[in-house]
Amino acid sequence: EINGSADHRMFSFHNGGVQISCKYPETVQQLKMRLFREREVLCELTKTKGSGNAVSIKNPMLCLYHLSNNSVSFFLNNPDSSQGSYYFCSLSIFDPPPFQERNLSGGYLHIYESQLCCQLKLWL
Amino acid sequence: EINGSADHRMFSFHNGGVQISCKYPETVQQLKMRLFREREVLCELTKTKGSGNAVSIKNPMLCLYHLSNNSVSFFLNNPDSSQGSYYFCSLSIFDPPPFQERNLSGGYLHIYESQLCCQLKLWL
C-alpha cells in the first residue's frame, strides 16, 4: 500500500506561483497523477510506456508540470488565496500491476500577500 | 465510444433527496463511476472482479448508492439548492479492455422548495 510521506516539501513558492509536489514510488513505471483542490481536479498527468523505451505523457488540463522518476510537480500560477484550501495528490498505478489507486499526502495551503509563506499541515 | 443517453431519467426525487442515475453498457464488467457537480467529485464507486466471480465494491466517499448491471444511482440527501448546478457522470471502464474514460450524460438541476420538480437540460 502506498501512502504519502512527510519527508518532502509538498509546497514551494516560485515567482509568485506555487509548486505542488506529488511523490510516488520509483518502482512505478506507468501512472496517472491527479492534483485535487478540495474535491476539484486541477491537474492530471498520465505517463505510459511503449514497446521500446518511448514514453507518452498526456496532460489534458494543460498544467505546467515537471516529471521525475519519483515525483510529479505541478505549477499553479494563481492559487486561490481567498481562503485556505486543502490540496492532495491522487495516484493511479498501471505498472507494475495490479491496477491501484491511492490518495497521497495532502496539505492545507494558506496564501499570504507575499506568497512566500504558507501554513501547512501534512495529512499522512 | 460510449456517450450518455437521454432514454433514462437522470434525476428523480425521494424523501426530500435526489437520486442521480448514471447509466453504463451492460457489457461493462469492471468500472469506476464518478458523479461530478461542476468539477467537484461528489461520489465515486468502483466495481472490480476477483479471479473467481467475487465482486469488490469500493465507495470511498461513502455515498448512498444502488448498483445494477447497467447503472449506478447515487442518492444525495442535501443537494445544493442555492443555485442551479450542472451534474454529470464520469465512467472509467477497466473490463472489457481497453481502458476508457468517458463523460456520460449530464444535466442542470434546479431544486425548488418542494424538491419535487427539477428543470433539466440533458447534455449528450
Partner: antibody, heavy 121, light 106 residues
Framework: EVQLVESGGGLVKPGGSLRLSCAAS????????MHWVRQAPGKGLEWVGV??????????YYSDLVKGRFTISRDDSKNTLYLQMNSLKTEDTAVYYC????????????WGQGTLVTVSS | DIQMTQSPSSLSASVGDRVTITCQAS??????LSWYQQKPGKAPKLLIY???LLAEGVPSRFSGSGSGTDFTFTISSLQPEDIATYYC????????FGPGTKVDIK
Amino acid sequence: EVQLVESGGGLVKPGGSLRLSCAASGFTFSDYFMHWVRQAPGKGLEWVGVIDTKSFNYATYYSDLVKGRFTISRDDSKNTLYLQMNSLKTEDTAVYYCTATIAVPYYFDYWGQGTLVTVSS
Amino acid sequence: DIQMTQSPSSLSASVGDRVTITCQASQDISNYLSWYQQKPGKAPKLLIYYTNLLAEGVPSRFSGSGSGTDFTFTISSLQPEDIATYYCQQYYNYRTFGPGTKVDIK
C-alpha cells in the same frame, strides 16, 4: 466478440515477397500494440515484431532474425495490421499469428488463428 | 536480446498431480513474465502475466512465482484438459518466448 483474422499466407519461392493482413474487430484497435508471432511446423513460438500506437508515433521493433527484411504497418481507420515480408528464406516457413496487447490499466492480449506461409522452391 | 530457457522440455504426469515448470531469463526481467498455454492446432492462450497474476477466466489451479531471472509455473492438480504445450514469455524488453514444455497424461 473480439476477432483477429489473418490472411495472405501461401506458397512463395525463396527470395520472394508476401504481404500478410490481420483484420481486427470487437475492440478499440487503435489503443493496442500489435505484434506478429510465428511458429515453424512442430516448433515453438517466435516473436517477429511489434508496432506501437499513435501515442508512440507508430514505432516498430523487430527480432534480429527478420530485421531489414520484414516491415510492420497498421491502418487504424481500417482496423488492419500488415506484415510485408521480403527476401523470404526457407526458415521463414511458419504459421504467422497477429496479436493485440494492452497493459493499462489491466493486461490483456488477443490472438488470431494464424495463416501459414510456406517458403519453398 | 534476452534469451529464455525452459525446463523440462516435456513431462508426463497423472491426473491430480502437481506439475511444475521452470523458466530462466538471460538477464533480469523484473516480473515482466507471462505464461501461455497452446493446444495442437490452436492459438496460444494467456494464462498468467506479471509473473503471478491470473488472466481473466483462468482457473486458480494455475499459478506462477519468481522474480529477476528465475520463474516457476505450477498446475496444482493436473486435469485432462490441461494437456498442452506451455510457454514462458518475457516482455521486459520487446518479447521473447521460451522453447516450451509439452505436458501430457501418463
